[in-house]
């Protein structure tokens, strides 16, 4: 059979080889559609309500006057010439309508590295077949599942017009150190050959590095933390971040009921003050960040203080943003 | 047919700016990138940058950041080219290309001539 | 950044003899995820524009005659001409879109003998 692709909505001509050039002809069209259960059998006489689908013209060949995706299928003539010699045509009819331009929707404008960020959505309406959907970063395609890249697709069928629509959801973790200001497109490749892909608009959102956390210090004066009843002991918690977070105390991994400060003052030190200590910074862009906890005792007089605090766990370390 | 129409040869003293036109006809304008590209006598060709003129995004070569600023104005199909505190290093053709993703610069204009000179 | 490089710089030839010229690119042009490489040829004439030859390597644009061909893969690339012309009087460059800043080779001038 041979190929035929037709735009859904144009008109099409299919030749009946071999029929004479105009009546009397013998000949017969017969149909395998999504219009037919079966075969159906079109002559030059014509009529009735088949006429506003598909008839036959005067020199034999088949006019559809606007083609639909129920016309997808078989066609075929069989023509008797003057001298009797039979010649049979053969048509595999395939129907397809290009979408509009793609677009990106829901676009993200910043990006943060190192984690997974929607970069955004790629939309496609009116195709037919459905076709395929593909990102690009710098005209180059994206592979899901590579390198931190992830897609969600989606294909949606209209009711009516049998036309689809293809949606496509992109998201990356972008590389430290990588372009500030990535380049994303998408683009629609028609499901028949022959058409060449459709590019939307590209996108360009800037890449955000997030400036990783220095370790919050905390200092004890004096040093290890060890000092006799009735003796001060500084803590001083330093964050070189900026602008200078909130700082909060806890003692024993409880909350000190005192107001923020970088400063705690502990005078005249009494066995109800000994215990593990710990400072937690808190960043508006970062959340908290708690230091390294270190241990306050009491040493009785003739005893050897230790040379330096016990360090207790890491703390909380950096919560993560939700 | 496709045509990428430059605007004409420019001496300029040092210090001053100048701007290029590009205008093209003969398809969408908004569905192609339109890249600058630099050609000094015996220094071989140097990319400067892309426009989309369908949502203005840019892109540059580093090492024309400052230099060169890229507009396009979508009513009359033209892209610009704006190039600033010209010195000598600046005199050469500049041309610009319409690009596909999938053909690379397919056609390009005449080129325009900048001289920079006191 | 990817530096081109193109060889020789410049040849002369008789009408009708073949010509290959040579690119090569500091670094791969072929990207893995769809095996096509990012490099393209220009033809430019005697105070004239540029002219887009060859695309992806190999792929001749609509137009140009078939005596240009294209071939390579990775860092090296050739553009042959099979039977050179005398309207291919002209400076050759080949040209790398595979990343930012996109790069020029220094060309290759072919005069006719």
């Known amino acids: 059979a041979q190929n035929i692709t037709a735009r859904i909505g144009e008109p099409l001509v299919l030749k009946c080889k071999g029929a004479p050039k105009k009546p009397p002809q013998r000949l017969e069209w017969k149909l395998n559609t999504g219009r037919t259960e079966a075969w159906k059998v079109l002559s030059p006489q014509g009529g009735g309500p088949w006429d506003s689908v598909a008839r036959v013209l005067p020199n034999g060949s088949l006019f559809l006057p606007a083609v639909g995706i129920q016309d997808e299928g078989i066609f075929r003539c069989q023509a008797m010439n003057r001298n009797g010699k039979e010649t049979k045509s053969n048509y595999r009819v395939r129907v397809y309508q290009i979408p509009g331009k793609p677009e990106i929707v829901d676009s993200a404008s910043e990006l943060t590295a190192g984690v997974p960020n929607k970069v955004g959505t790629c939309v496609s309406e009116g195709s037919y077949p459905a076709g395929t959907l593909s990102w690009h970063l710098d005209g180059k395609p994206l592979v899901p599942n590579e390198k931190g890249v992830s897609v969600k697709e989606q294909t949606r069928r209209h009711p009516e017009t049998g036309l689809f629509t293809l949606q496509s959801e992109l998201m990356v973790t972008p590389a430290r150190g990588g372009d500030p200001r990535p380049t994303f497109s998408c683009s629609f490749s028609p499901g028949l050959p022959r058409h060449r892909a459709l590019r939307t608009a590209p996108i360009q959102p800037r890449v955000w590095e997030p400036v990783p956390l220095e370790e919050v210090q905390l200092v004890v004066e004096p040093e290890g933390g060890a000092v006799a009843p009735g003796g001060t002991v500084t803590l001083t918690c330093e964050v070189p971040a900026q602008p200078s977070p909130q700082i909060h105390w806890m003692k024993d991994g409880v909350p000190l009921p005192l107001p923020p400060s970088p400063v705690l003052i502990l005078p005249e030190i009494g066995p109800q003050d000994q215990g593990t200590y710990s400072c937690v910074a808190t960043h508006s862009s970062h959340g908290p960040q708690e230091s390294r906890a270190v241990s306050i005792s009491i040493i009785e007089p003739g005893e050897e203080g230790p040379t330096a605090g016990s360090v207790g766990g890491s703390g909380l370390g950096t919560l993560a943003l939700a | 047919q496709v045509q990428l129409q430059q605007s004409g040869p420019e001496l300029v003293k040092p210090g001053a700016s100048v701007r290029i036109s590009c205008k093209a006809s003969?398809?969408?304008?908004?569905?192609?990138?339109i890249h600058w590209v630099k050609q000094r006598p015996g220094q071989g060709l140097e990319w400067i940058g892309w426009?989309?003129?369908?949502?203005?995004?840019?892109k540059y070569n580093e090492k024309f950041k400052g230099k060169a600023t890229l507009t396009a104005d979508k009513s009359s199909s033209t892209a610009y080219m704006q190039l600033s505190s010209l010195t000598s290093e600046d005199s050469a053709v500049y041309f610009c290309?319409?690009?596909?993703?999938?053909?690379?610069?397919?056609?390009w204009g005449q080129g325009t001539s900048v001289t920079v000179s006191s | 950044d990817i530096v081109m490089s193109q060889s020789p710089s410049s040849l002369a030839v008789s009408v009708g003899e073949k010509v290959t010229m040579s690119c090569k690119s500091s670094?791969?042009?072929?990207?893995?995820?769809?095996?096509?490489?990012?490099l393209a040829w220009y033809q430019q004439k005697p105070g004239q524009s540029l002219k887009l030859l060859i695309y992806?390597?190999?792929t001749r644009e609509s137009g140009v005659p078939d005596r240009f061909a294209g071939s390579g893969s990775g860092t090296d690339f050739t553009l042959t001409i099979s039977s050179v012309k005398a309207e291919d009087l002209a400076v050759y460059y080949c040209?790398?879109?595979?990343?930012?800043?996109?790069?020029f080779g220094g060309g290759t001038k072919l005069e006719i003998k």
């Open positions: 290309a319409r690009y596909d993703y999938d053909y690379a610069m397919d056609y």
């Open positions: 003969g398809y969408t304008f908004t569905d192609y990138y």
């Open positions: 426009i989309y003129p369908g949502n203005v995004i840019t």
């Open positions: 670094q791969t042009l072929l990207y893995s995820s769809n095996q096509k490489n990012y």
């Open positions: 992806w390597a190999s």
């Open positions: 040209q790398q879109y595979f990343g930012y800043p996109y790069t």
